[in-house]
C-alpha cells in the first residue's frame, strides 16, 4: 500500500513539476526591468526565452519574437536546449510512469517490468528536473552578471549633460516557477525510484535456492534480494523457496501469479 502511495504521489508531483517546467519555458517574464529606483514606470520591459515584450502604462503591450537563431547569445540557446530536453524527458517519463503505476493493470505485465519502468521514469524525472534547474540557474547567473555590468555602466557614463537611462533587468516570475517546478520534478523522480525498490521485492525477496520443475538442477542463491536486483530474466517462471527459514520481510510476501510453473 505504501509503495502504491509513494509511486502515485511521485507521479502526481512529477506531473505538476513538468507542467511547471512547460509553463516556465513558455512564459515571457524570465527577466523583468528592474524598478528599484523607479517603482512607477511609463514603459516596462520584460523578456522570455522566445520573445521580448514592452508594456506601456497606458495598457498597450507589444511582444516581438527572436526571429534570428544565429544572432542569439549562446547562453540563451543553451537555456532553451536545457528546458526543451527537460520537457521531452519529463514527457517520456510521464508516459512510461503511467504504464508503471501499480494501480493500473495492463494485460499480464509482471511486477518486475513495472519496477523496471518505475525506475526508468524516476531517473527521467530526476534528469528532467536537473535540466530545468540548470537552465533557470544559467539564465539567473547571466542576469546577475549583466545587472552588475549595467550598474557599473550607469555610474561611469554620467559625465555628459544628457542622461541616457540604461535598462537593468532582474529575475522574472518564470525563474521562480522554473526552480520550483524543477525541484518538484526532481522530488517526484526520487519518489518513483524509492517506489521501485518497494515494487521489486514482491517477486524476488524469497531467499535461498532456485528450484526448477524438472528437479534436476539446483542453483544456490546466497544473497536473496540484496544479491539480485530482480530485473534479470533469472527470476522468470522459477519457484524460489527458503526451506522453511523466513526473514521478517518475507512474512508479508504472498505468492504472485508467476510463482508457480
Amino acid at each position: 500500500m505504501a509503495v502504491t502511495a509513494c509511486q502515485g504521489l511521485g507521479f502526481v508531483v512529477s506531473l505538476i513539476g513538468i507542467a511547471g517546467i512547460i509553463a516556465a519555458t513558455c512564459m515571457d517574464q524570465w527577466s523583468t526591468q528592474d524598478l528599484y529606483n523607479n517603482p512607477v514606470t511609463a514603459v516596462f520591459n520584460y523578456q522570455g526565452l522566445w520573445r521580448s515584450c514592452v508594456r506601456e502604462s497606458s495598457g498597450f503591450t507589444e511582444c516581438r519574437g527572436y526571429f534570428t537563431l544565429l544572432g542569439l547569445p549562446a547562453m540563451l540557446q543553451a537555456v532553451r536546449a536545457l528546458m526543451i530536453v527537460g520537457i521531452v524527458l519529463g514527457a517520456i517519463g510521464l508516459l512510461v510512469s503511467i504504464f508503471a503505476l501499480k494501480c493500473i493493470r495492463i494485460g499480464s505485465m509482471e511486477d518486475s517490468a513495472k519496477a523496471n519502468m518505475t525506475l526508468t521514469s524516476g531517473i527521467m524525472f530526476i534528469v528532467s528536473g536537473l535540466c530545468a534547474i540548470a537552465g533557470v540557474s544559467v539564465f539567473a547567473n547571466m542576469l546577475v552578471t549583466n545587472f552588475w555590468m549595467s550598474t557599473a555602466n550607469m555610474y561611469t557614463g554620467m559625465g555628459g549633460m544628457v542622461q541616457t537611462v540604461q535598462t537593468r533587468y532582474t529575475f522574472g516570475a518564470a525563474l521562480f516557477v522554473g526552480w520550483v517546478a524543477g525541484g518538484l520534478t526532481l522530488i517526484g523522480g526520487v519518489m518513483m525510484c524509492i517506489a521501485c525498490r518497494g515494487l521489486a521485492p514482491e517477486e524476488t525477496n524469497y531467499k535461498a535456492v532456485s528450484y526448477h520443475a524438472s528437479g534436476h538442477s539446483v542453483a544456490y542463491k546466497p544473497g536473496g534480494f540484496k544479491a539480485s536486483t530482480g530485473f534479470g530474466s533469472n527470476t522468470k517462471n522459477k519457484k524460489i523457496y527458503d526451506g522453511g527459514a523466513r526473514t521478517e520481510d518475507e512474512v508479508q510476501s504472498y505468492p504472485s501469479k508467476h510463482d508457480y510453473v
Epitope: V40, A42, V43, Y46, V54, S57, S58, T167
Partner: antibody, heavy 118, light 113 residues
Framework: QVQLQESGPGLVKPSETLSLTCTVS?????????WNWIRQPPGKGLEWMGY???????NYNPSLKSRITISRDTSKNQFSLKLSSVTAADTAVYYC???????????WGQGTLVTVSS | DIVMTQSPDSLAVSLGERATINCKSS????????????LTWYQQKPGQPPKLLIY???TRESGVPDRFSGSGSGTDFTLTISSLQAEDVAVYYC?????????FGQGTKVEIK
C-alpha cells in the same frame, strides 16, 4: 470610436475643490486604456495632470499629487477629477483624454474652461 | 522631470514650402526593450483640443496626411511638414511619453508667410 465629454462647474471659488466628470461613449472605461486629465491655462501650453488606468490604478503629476484625485465609475462609464485648494493659477481649459499605444493621447474631449475666481 | 524644449517658438512658411520643428529632451526617450523613441507630436488648432499626429517619434497616426513626418532618436527629434497647406496653421507640441510625469514642449506656432 471612443468619444469623451467633460462636464462640471465653469466657476470655482479659491480654496474650494474643483470637480469634473468625463463621460465615455463608444467604448468601455474598463477596456485596456488609460484615462487622463490634461489642462491648458489660457494662451499657454499643455500640462498632464494624471490618469486612472484599465485596472483602476492611478498615477499623478508630482506637482499636483497632494491635491489631485482621479476616480472612476464603471457603471456610469465615467471618470472624475477632483482638485482641492484651488487658486487662480488653476484657471485653465481641462481636457479628458484616452492614452494607449506609445503612451500617446489618441482621443480627446472638447475641453471645459474652469475659472477660479471669488 | 524630463524637460522638453521646442524650437523655434514660431515659424512662418510659404504655402507649399517645407516646415521643420525641432524638439529636444533633457533625457533620452529611447527604450532599449523595443528600440522605440517615446516621443509624440500633436497639432492644436484654435478653439480645438490637440490632435495626435505622430507617436513613437516616427509612426504616423491613421488618417494623418503623409506630408507630416517625424524623425530623430534619443534626445533630438524633428517634425517635418513637407508641403505646408493652409489647414496646417496651428500650434504643434511634442510630448515625452517615456517617463513620468509626461511632459509637453512649450509649443511651436506655424503660420503662413
Amino acid at each position: 470610436q471612443v468619444q469623451l465629454q467633460e462636464s462640471g462647474p465653469g466657476l470655482v471659488k479659491p480654496s474650494e475643490t474643483l470637480s469634473l466628470t468625463c463621460t465615455v461613449s463608444g467604448g468601455s472605461i474598463s477596456s485596456n486604456y488609460a484615462w487622463n486629465w490634461i489642462r491648458q491655462p489660457p494662451g499657454k501650453g499643455l500640462e498632464w495632470m494624471g490618469y486612472i488606468n484599465y485596472s483602476g490604478n492611478t498615477n499623478y503629476n508630482p506637482s499636483l499629487k497632494s491635491r489631485i484625485t482621479i476616480s472612476r465609475d464603471t457603471s456610469k462609464n465615467q471618470f472624475s477629477l477632483k482638485l482641492s485648494s484651488v487658486t487662480a493659477a488653476d484657471t485653465a481649459v481641462y481636457y479628458c483624454a484616452t492614452s494607449y499605444y506609445g503612451n500617446s493621447f489618441i482621443y480627446w474631449g472638447q475641453g471645459t474652461l474652469v475659472t477660479v475666481s471669488s | 522631470d524630463i524637460v522638453m524644449t521646442q524650437s523655434p517658438d514660431s515659424l512662418a512658411v510659404s504655402l507649399g514650402e517645407r516646415a521643420t520643428i525641432n524638439c529636444k529632451s533633457s533625457q533620452s526617450l529611447l527604450n532599449s526593450g523595443n528600440q522605440k523613441n517615446y516621443l509624440t507630436w500633436y497639432q492644436q488648432k484654435p478653439g480645438q483640443p490637440p490632435k495626435l499626429l505622430i507617436y513613437w517619434a516616427s509612426t504616423r497616426e491613421s488618417g494623418v496626411p503623409d506630408r507630416f513626418s517625424g524623425s530623430g532618436s534619443g534626445t533630438d527629434f524633428t517634425l517635418t511638414i513637407s508641403s505646408l497647406q493652409a489647414e496646417d496653421v496651428a500650434v504643434y507640441y511634442c510630448q515625452n511619453a517615456y517617463s513620468f510625469p509626461w511632459t509637453f514642449g512649450q509649443g511651436t506656432k506655424v503660420e503662413i508667410k
